[in-house]
């Protein structure tokens, strides 16, 4: 079968599938397409995974290329490392396999690059411009187990047709991911439909054992079944319910599983439990209970806004600092006379490509629940779990169209309470001055309804929110960042967008690239995103400066003595990387221990300025933070860096503040 036929094709193993989509896309478009189906761009990290990719791609034309999930920021060459400074879109640089087309050569790496796989020959890895639309892309889908393909039976009219949770339909699968459906047509005219489900005894298996095409006994009275009657192998009958219903306790009648309103927002019949819960756009299922929905903090998605982002229940908005105004795309900021521009992003505006109907802006604002976020130049997203196919997967949608998801209905958030404790909260209290706005700030908008400040008792000392004041010494006023108001009930003045700032002991040369940001910290309906920090700089956290807006009585000021602790490398076994070479067969390349970064349990992404001597490798499982690619648009002129959290007891050091990124990037992280 020609992999370059119009239809996608896939190859599955017991725990993951690769799928080839022969559709011309840019890297960002390909990344989005995989994510929309619940997967990611392919990350073949081992020779075994690479072999599966080879088998899937086959012997294609030399002129065709397929995106895989490797991307590198500008000036992030690390030629001594197996991935050469490239990072998997899942957020790490771990690999036991590489297949570069050429040996590494020195160079400044001035532009961002993405990796495509040659469709022909050895399927070598080539780097190139992320904005080029190459011929196709490879997605990877992980899941909790798989069912083996069904054996053909004598009474079958043809091979079983399988539909995967990621919408691929084929008769060719060897393994079927959990959540797949098998349709078997029998010569007698009847058919059977099976689901790959979790088994009570553990593992996964087909919802029904074979043989599937035998038996009789439904003719009298439909076998006593309310909906469908199925004749089993041993002659007895089983009752089934049509789509949207499940079998009642009596085994014969059918009931609507959504009738009892088991879901907080949206219920859809089907799936192993008989129903699946879905959340409206702007919400996501709660981790502890998939029946409930919690607000998605879109401001945690890297690059959602160029400068500042405010999250509210069910949506978010972008803002620009004083002297800048929001461009028509609702994301970018450009210098102008106007101040405090904003545009509502009701999730579907920018994150989804095709336009859905905009929610009324007034309604959207009624749902406002807090928090300004100053966006750094590049951000990393929190890890996302693969979809749980114990819940029914989304219905398929036509190629090149986004799923039409209804907008959330606005609701007022509950009164403000003590901040939610973020992951690694005990660490954060030691290592990172968390800046969280606990106000619902007045937003400069003609469309905004009155904001009623939430009143609440003073927070206990454990939950008080530090305020960091700041100055950049010896900077022209054009480069001076503003100050973020982090007072509790006080509202920022109209047309004055709040900002964050921190005093830095020095500024660093413009040619040094900024660090990749750290994982984000969640507050009460509010998040301030703080990027990662390179080692060897101590933070200077000071009391409030002259530019500080008036403080409310319960807004504490953080007074901290910064301690600089050395980062002590620990031993790490050398990573053995299998590398294919264009001139020799696959062989093992042992990377010398000297080139290995220390195996610190860190949340810092490993990219760092090229002059940093001890890059930290994200080998800790919590460090695999997915990245979101971004194309187009200039980088911010000034990146603001604050100390970051790491799961250690020691404070991390202060990052480099880079004034530059004047060069427009090839593409950027979202």
């Amino acid at each position: 079968q020609d992999p370059w036929a119009a239809e996608p094709r896939s190859a599955c193993g017991p725990s993951s599938c690769y799928a080839l989509f022969p559709r011309r896309r840019t890297f960002l478009e390909a990344w989005r397409a995989c994510r929309e189906l619940g997967g990611d761009l392919a990350t073949p990290r081992t020779p075994e995974e690479a072999q599966r990719v080879d088998n899937l791609v086959g012997a294609g034309p030399a002129s065709r290329l397929l995106w895989i999930g490797l991307q590198r920021q500008a000036r992030q060459c690390q030629l001594q490392r197996p991935l050469r400074g490239f990072t998997w879109t899942t957020g790490d640089q771990d690999t036991a396999f590489t297949n570069w087309a050429q040996p590494a050569t020195g160079g400044p790496c001035p532009a961002q690059r993405c990796v495509a796989l040659e469709a022909s020959g050895e399927h070598r890895w080539l780097e190139g411009s992320c904005t080029l639309a190459v011929d196709g892309y490879l997605c990877q889908f992980g899941f909790e187990g798989a069912c083996p393909a069904l054996q053909d039976e004598a009474g079958q009219a043809g091979p079983a047709v399988y539909t995967t949770p990621f919408h691929l339909v084929s008769t060719e699968f060897e393994w079927l991911p959990f959540g797949s459906v098998a349709a078997v047509q029998c010569q007698a005219g009847r058919g059977a439909s099976l689901l790959c489900v979790k088994q009570p005894e553990g593992g996964v298996g087909w919802s029904r054992a074979g043989p599937l095409c035998l038996g009789a006994g439904c003719s009298p009275d439909n076998g006593g079944c309310e909906h469908e009657c199925v004749e089993e192998v041993d002659g007895h009958v089983s009752c089934r319910c049509t789509e949207g219903f499940r079998l009642a306790a009596d085994g014969r009648s059918c009931e609507d599983p959504c009738a009892q309103a088991p879901c907080e927002q949206q219920c859809e019949p089907g799936g192993p439990q008989g129903y699946s819960c879905h959340c409206r756009l702007g919400f996501r299922p709660a981790e502890d209970d998939p029946h409930r929905c919690v607000d998605t903090d879109e401001c945690q998605i890297a690059g959602v806004c160029q400068q500042m982002c405010v999250n509210y229940v069910g949506g978010f908005e972008c803002y620009c600092s004083e002297g800048h105004e929001l461009e028509a795309d609702g994301i970018s900021c450009s210098p102008a006379g106007a101040m405090g521009a904003r545009a509502s992003q009701d999730l579907g505006d920018e994150l989804l490509d095709d336009g859905e109907d905009e929610e009324d802006e007034d309604e959207a604002w009624e749902a406002f629940g807090g928090g300004w976020t100053e966006m750094p130049g590049i951000l990393w997203m929190e890890p996302t779990q693969p979809p749980d196919f114990a819940l029914a997967y989304r219905p398929s949608f036509p190629e090149d169209r986004e799923p039409q998801i209804p907008y959330p209905e606005p609701t007022w958030p509950p009164p403000l309470s003590a901040p939610r404790v973020p992951y690694h909260s005990s660490v954060l209290s030691v290592t990172r001055p968390v800046v969280v706005s606990a106000t619902r700030p007045t937003l400069p908008s003609a469309h905004q309804p009155p904001v009623i400040p939430a009143t609440h008792p003073a927070l206990s000392r454990d939950h008080q929110i530090p305020v960091i004041a700041a100055n950049y010494p010896d900077l022209p006023s054009a480069y001076q960042p503003g100050i973020l108001s982090v007072s509790h009930p006080a509202q920022p003045p109209a047309h004055q967008p709040p900002m964050i700032s921190t005093r830095y002991p020095e500024l660093f040369p413009a040619h040094q690239s900024p660090m990749f940001p750290d994982t984000q910290v969640a507050g009460t309906q509010t998040t301030t995103h703080l990027p990662a920090i390179p080692p060897n700089r101590a933070p200077l956290v000071t009391t409030l400066g002259a530019h500080q807006p008036p403080q409310a009585p319960d807004a504490p000021v953080l007074r901290t003595q910064a301690t600089q602790l050395p980062i002590i490398p620990t031993a790490q076994p050398s990573l053995t990387t299998s590398s294919r070479s264009p001139v020799s067969p696959a062989h093992q390349v042992s990377v010398p221990a000297a080139t290995q970064p220390p195996a610190l349990p860190t949340l810092l992404p490993s990219q760092s300025p090229t002059n940093q001597t001890s890059p930290i490798s994200p080998t800790h499982p919590h460090s695999k933070v997915p990245q979101i690619p971004r194309e187009d648009g200039p980088s911010p002129k000034l990146a603001l860096w604050l100390p970051s959290a790491a799961p250690t007891a020691a404070p991390t050091a202060l990052g480099e503040a880079s004034l530059a990124e004047h060069i427009q990037r090839d593409d950027r992280w979202l």
């Epitope: 030399a62 050429q102 080029l132 990037r665 090839d666």
Partner: antibody, heavy 124, light 108 residues
């Protein structure tokens, strides 16, 4: 060595058709996409369309509204470009070019080899 | 369509001079830009691909830089054989190539 050799100059009347050829040598013909461009006197180059010899996949510039057809004779390693309903403004030098696949470990869509060009004159 | 604007259109220079030609794109094209040299009656020759990568066999006096919307071709020390027409090309929305109008280098 890689070469693209184009057919000789043509003089046509308005309304007529012209079919130009581009013979490739020195490489595996089915491994590289062939593009056609043209350059009218004093004007910049203009992309017309491409063909992929691997599977005869073609894409054309909408500007030519169905007037252009690109075909192949794979056995002769030759690509053809036919332009119909000629008008005086179609007077130009027509180029075929090979799109590169990869250079030194980079993939890129620039043209690494060009034909010498064919002058087509449309005049009544 | 993405428009490419080259400047200057003409340049009179001498052997040994340093020459810089610029190419501006009407929108962000990343690094999907190539530079070509064309002599009268001859086929164009690829000099630079992906904005800054020198093509095989191209002398080191030719260099390219830029990303986004502004790109430059630099000839560090002009040689007699370098007097020719130079043009840029973008291919970010492949296959819809667009080209600059060209810069003619003449001997002063």
């Amino acid at each position: 060595q890689v070469q693209l050799v184009q057919s000789g100059p043509e003089v046509k009347k308005p309304g007529a058709s012209v079919k130009l050829s581009c013979k490739a040598s020195g490489y595996t013909f089915t491994d590289y996409v062939i593009h056609w461009m043209r350059q009218a006197p004093g004007q910049r180059l203009e992309w017309m369309g491409y063909i992929n010899p691997y599977d005869d996949d073609t894409t054309y510039n909408q500007k030519f509204k169905g007037r252009v057809t690109i075909t192949l004779d794979t056995s002769a390693s030759t690509a053809y470009m036919e332009l119909n309903s000629l008008r005086s403004e179609d007077t130009a030098v027509y180029y075929c070019a090979r799109r590169g696949n990869s250079y030194d470990g980079y993939f890129d869509y620039s043209m690494d080899y060009w034909g010498q060009g064919t002058l087509v004159t449309v005049s009544s | 369509d993405i428009q490419l604007t080259q400047s200057p259109k003409f340049m009179s220079t001498s052997v040994g001079d340093k020459v810089t030609i610029t190419c501006r794109a009407s929108q962000n094209v990343g690094t999907a830009v190539a530079w070509y040299q064309q002599k009268p009656g001859k086929a164009p020759k690829l000099l630079i691909y992906s904005a800054s990568n020198r093509y095989t066999g191209v002398p080191s006096r030719f260099s390219g830089s830029g990303s986004g919307t502004e790109f430059t071709l630099t000839i560090s020390s002009l040689q007699p054989e370098d007097f020719a027409n130079y043009f840029c090309q973008q291919y970010t929305n492949y296959p819809m190539y667009t080209f600059g109008q060209g810069t003619k280098l003449e001997i002063k």
